[in-house]
């Protein structure tokens, strides 16, 4: 079943290559287990950036080597992606799945265009 997912259209990462945005979903029921996946679309190709499954009220747990971290509050997930460089500029799409209890719901946002600026090199010092 389809579910509405909202996310900001455009975000500029900070000078350290960190971008945060909220992914909000319109939950039709009382889900206890939610899966959030961040997808990156660039050059017409979609790749998975990171994913986490969490129990409502608990923290999101991404894999140890993931570039993503996040927190949840109600029907909102605050996602942070770090280690970004200019070449990582692209459309980052939030996918939310309500895993348990049934019925299963899934929603995909329109994507957040994340722009990343590589830091300017420091001038050489003598």
């Amino acid at each position: 079943k389809a579910m509405h997912v909202a996310q900001p259209a455009v975000v500029l990462a900070n000078s350290r290559g960190i971008a945060s945005f909220v992914c909000e979903y319109a939950s039709p029921g009382k889900a206890t287990e939610v899966r959030v996946t961040v997808l990156r679309q660039a050059d017409s190709q979609v790749t998975e950036v990171c994913a986490a499954t969490y129990m409502m009220g608990n923290e999101l747990t991404f894999l140890d080597d993931s570039i993503c971290t996040g927190t949840s509050s109600g029907n909102q997930v605050n996602l942070t992606i770090q280690g970004l460089r200019a070449m990582d500029t692209g459309l980052y799409i939030c996918k939310v799945e309500l895993m348990y209890p049934p019925p299963y719901y899934m929603g995909i946002g329109n994507g957040t265009q994340i722009y990343v600026i590589d830091p300017e090199p420091c001038p050489d010092s003598d």
Epitope: P8, A9, V10, L12, D43, L91, Q113, Y115
Partner: antibody
Framework: QVQLVQSGAEVKKPGASVKVSCKAS????????ISWVRQAPGQGLEWMGW????????NYAQKFKGRVTMTTDTSTSTAYMELRSLRSDDMAVYYC??????????WGQGTTVTVSS | DIQMTQSPSSLSASVGDRVTITCRAS??????LNWYQQNPGKAPKLLIY???SLQGGVPSRFSGSGSGTDFTLTISSLQPEDFATYYC?????????FGPGTKVDIK
């Protein structure tokens, strides 16, 4: 409908500053960015920089760094662009434009800035 | 920074003509290329985004194509209201950069 309304024309002396406002309506202001673009008489479009309204991060064009400041007031859905130390070659029409995932889709009507002693 | 060039810088054409404007980027910008139309004394207007997608309300006589570094804007049958200046702009990387523009006037 979605629109950006800019402040009126300004006449400034060389060395002075100008602050142009851009009021957004009928969309979620924080979900998009605001770019500032200027156009000198008879010239093309020159991108000055943009502000990510969502988080306040800013990217200025190298040419304007140190002389321009872009800000937003989310309580009034208004963006501002201040340009300091005005020179005669800053005479131009200044536009704000909404930055989306797919280009700058909505533009303000433009603000004419005249620099004259 | 990514540099954008356009050709021709100006052209003269008649109502009903097919017009083609080209835009070239100094490095690959994938499909992140937008086209704007500007009439004298007016703000620019987004015509085409991501190379070939028509902005809402834009007539279907406008079309865009290309990828990588070379892009084209085509007006299949020029109408009186199409006499204007056209700019390409890349949104692949910041700083966003515009082409110098192509002025389309009446022959």
């Amino acid at each position: 409908q979605v629109q950006l309304v800019q402040s009126g024309a300004e006449v400034k002396k060389p060395g002075a500053s100008v602050k142009v406002s851009c009021k957004a309506s009928d969309y979620t202001f924080t979900s998009y960015g605001i770019s500032w673009v200027r156009q000198a008489p008879g010239q093309g479009l020159e991108w000055m920089g943009w502000i990510s309204v969502y988080n306040g991060n800013i990217n200025y064009a190298q040419k304007f760094k140190g002389r321009v400041t872009m800000t937003t007031d989310t309580s009034t859905s208004t963006a501002y662009m201040e340009l300091r130390s005005l020179r005669s070659d800053d005479m131009a029409v200044y536009y704000c434009a909404r930055v989306t995932q797919f280009g700058m889709d909505v533009w303000g009507q433009g603000t004419t800035v005249t620099v004259s002693s | 920074d990514i540099q954008m060039t356009q050709s021709p810088s100006s052209l003269s054409a008649s109502v009903g003509d097919r017009v083609t404007i080209t835009c070239r980027a100094s490095q690959s910008i994938s499909s992140n290329l937008n086209w704007y139309q500007q009439n004298p004394g007016k703000a620019p207007k987004l015509l085409i985004y991501t190379t070939s997608s028509l902005q809402g309300g834009v007539p279907s006589r406008f079309s865009g194509s290309g990828s990588g570094t070379d892009f084209t804007l085509t007006i299949s049958s020029l109408q009186p209201e199409d006499f204007a200046t056209y700019y390409c702009q890349q949104s692949f990387r910041t700083p966003f950069t515009f082409g110098p523009g192509t002025k389309v006037d009446i022959k």
